[in-house]
Amino acid sequence: LIIGFGISGRHSITVTTVASAGNIGEDGILSCTFEPDIKLSDIVIQWLKEGVLGLVHEFKEGKDELSEQDEMFRGRTAVFADQVIVGNASLRLKNVQLTDAGTYKCYIITSKGKGNANLEYKTGAFSMPEVNVDYNASSETLRCEAPRWFPQPTVVWASQVDQGANFSEVSNTSFELNSENVTMKVVSVLYNVTINNTYSCMIENDIAKATGDIKVTESEIKRRSHLQLLNSKAS
């Protein structure tokens, strides 16, 4: 969490951002909140990115002002206009690109004063894994698949029954480049699976951590998946 305060002259206002991550090809949110003003027309929101000459986005006098917007963000940004009055300056970024990663500044001017806060935005790809029983004539195996990851993640298997066991010798993980030549499909196979046990396939890179759990019994197979973004720090 980054909390920024205003500077000289007018009073300072508190601006708060949260470090976040964007999933390549999907829409992302750059979070920023500020002390609200009574009049929308008195609020100016400017989003800037370190190393980029033009603005990422500008909102003033109740509407978007995009004449100074940098080409790389053209047609891809929007604020939540109806929420600005209550202090929400968050930016929606469409079709997140790898190159969108970096340091952003949320700069606010209101009748009460000015303020800004920085935000670290990471980009990559992350997806929910699906774990299934794979069958071949010799033995049962578990297959953990996740369609989109970048950068290349690590994959670790764990078991409820054999806690602390190292499954690297009885598992095999492969990474297959997807058609857009950036993200990769993750496939990990675990051999010598025993029934009445819960197994977890954990996929992690510096952006996200995902877990696929499977409990295999004779009468049913229970599955659940979780995805957690890492380093979501507020400023």
Partner: antibody, heavy 114, light 107 residues
């Protein structure tokens, strides 16, 4: 003994929503997942999804994601399935079944008609 | 999705007969297969799970076999109350899928 009780029939208009119930008894509700299955007239069975009543974790059949919403009320040991923006294609018998699908409700016949 | 196929949609047999209903999966599902009985009034009951395990309260005349992709349900001595439609279902992979059903009738 294990029982899953469902209303016999529901009649709703096209475009409307309906919330089907499945009241359970005879076992610990939160210890077993609940499944929902659809059967169109004269057709076979289609699995809609499953919900873990202990924490409301859900696995949907992608075909029904966005159409069906599964919920539970632990206090009354009841599972629900809401179907929205109904069309004639939704006219079917809907069953709830306790995981591992060992006990089934009698089914609710949903008729979507103006 | 895994396709489950019951090639025989209806089957006619005499009381006392040994009846076999088959089911095949489009890919290997190990032994993760259930058999259900649906009576004409719509009541559904689990007969067999994990290919060959008899569910509690199910008569021993019902048995199941198979592994991988090919499975069968056998009724050794057909009784009047066995007149129903029988469905196989795989639970190896989401979404769980059912066969089209085999309707059993008396000659």
């Amino acid at each position: 003994q294990v029982q899953l009780r469902q209303p016999g029939a529901e009649l709703v208009k096209p475009g409307a929503s309906v919330k089907l119930s499945c009241k359970t008894s005879g076992y610990t509700f939160t210890s077993y997942w609940m499944h929902w299955v659809k059967q169109r007239p004269g057709q076979g069975l289609e699995w809609i999804g499953e919900i873990d009543p202990s924490d409301s974790y859900i696995n949907y059949n992608q075909k029904f994601k966005g159409e069906a919403t599964l919920t539970v009320d632990k206090s009354s040991s009841t599972a629900y399935m809401q179907l929205s923006s109904l069309t004639s294609e939704d006219s079917a018998v809907y069953y709830c079944a306790r995981g591992p699908r060992d006990y089934w409700g009698q089914g609710t016949t949903l008729t979507v008609s103006s | 999705d895994i396709q489950m196929t019951q090639t025989t949609s209806s089957l006619s047999a005499s009381l006392g007969d040994r009846v076999t209903i088959s089911c095949s999966a489009s890919q290997g599902i190990s032994n993760y297969l259930n058999w259900y009985q649906q009576k004409p009034d719509g009541t559904v009951k689990l007969l067999i799970y994990y290919t060959s395990r008899l569910h509690s309260g199910v008569p021993s005349r019902f048995s199941g076999s198979g592994s991988g992709t090919d499975f069968s349900l056998t009724i050794s001595n057909l009784e009047p109350e066995d007149i129903a439609t029988y469905y196989c279902q795989q639970y190896s992979k989401l979404p769980y899928t059912f066969g089209g059903g085999t309707k059993l009738e008396v000659k």
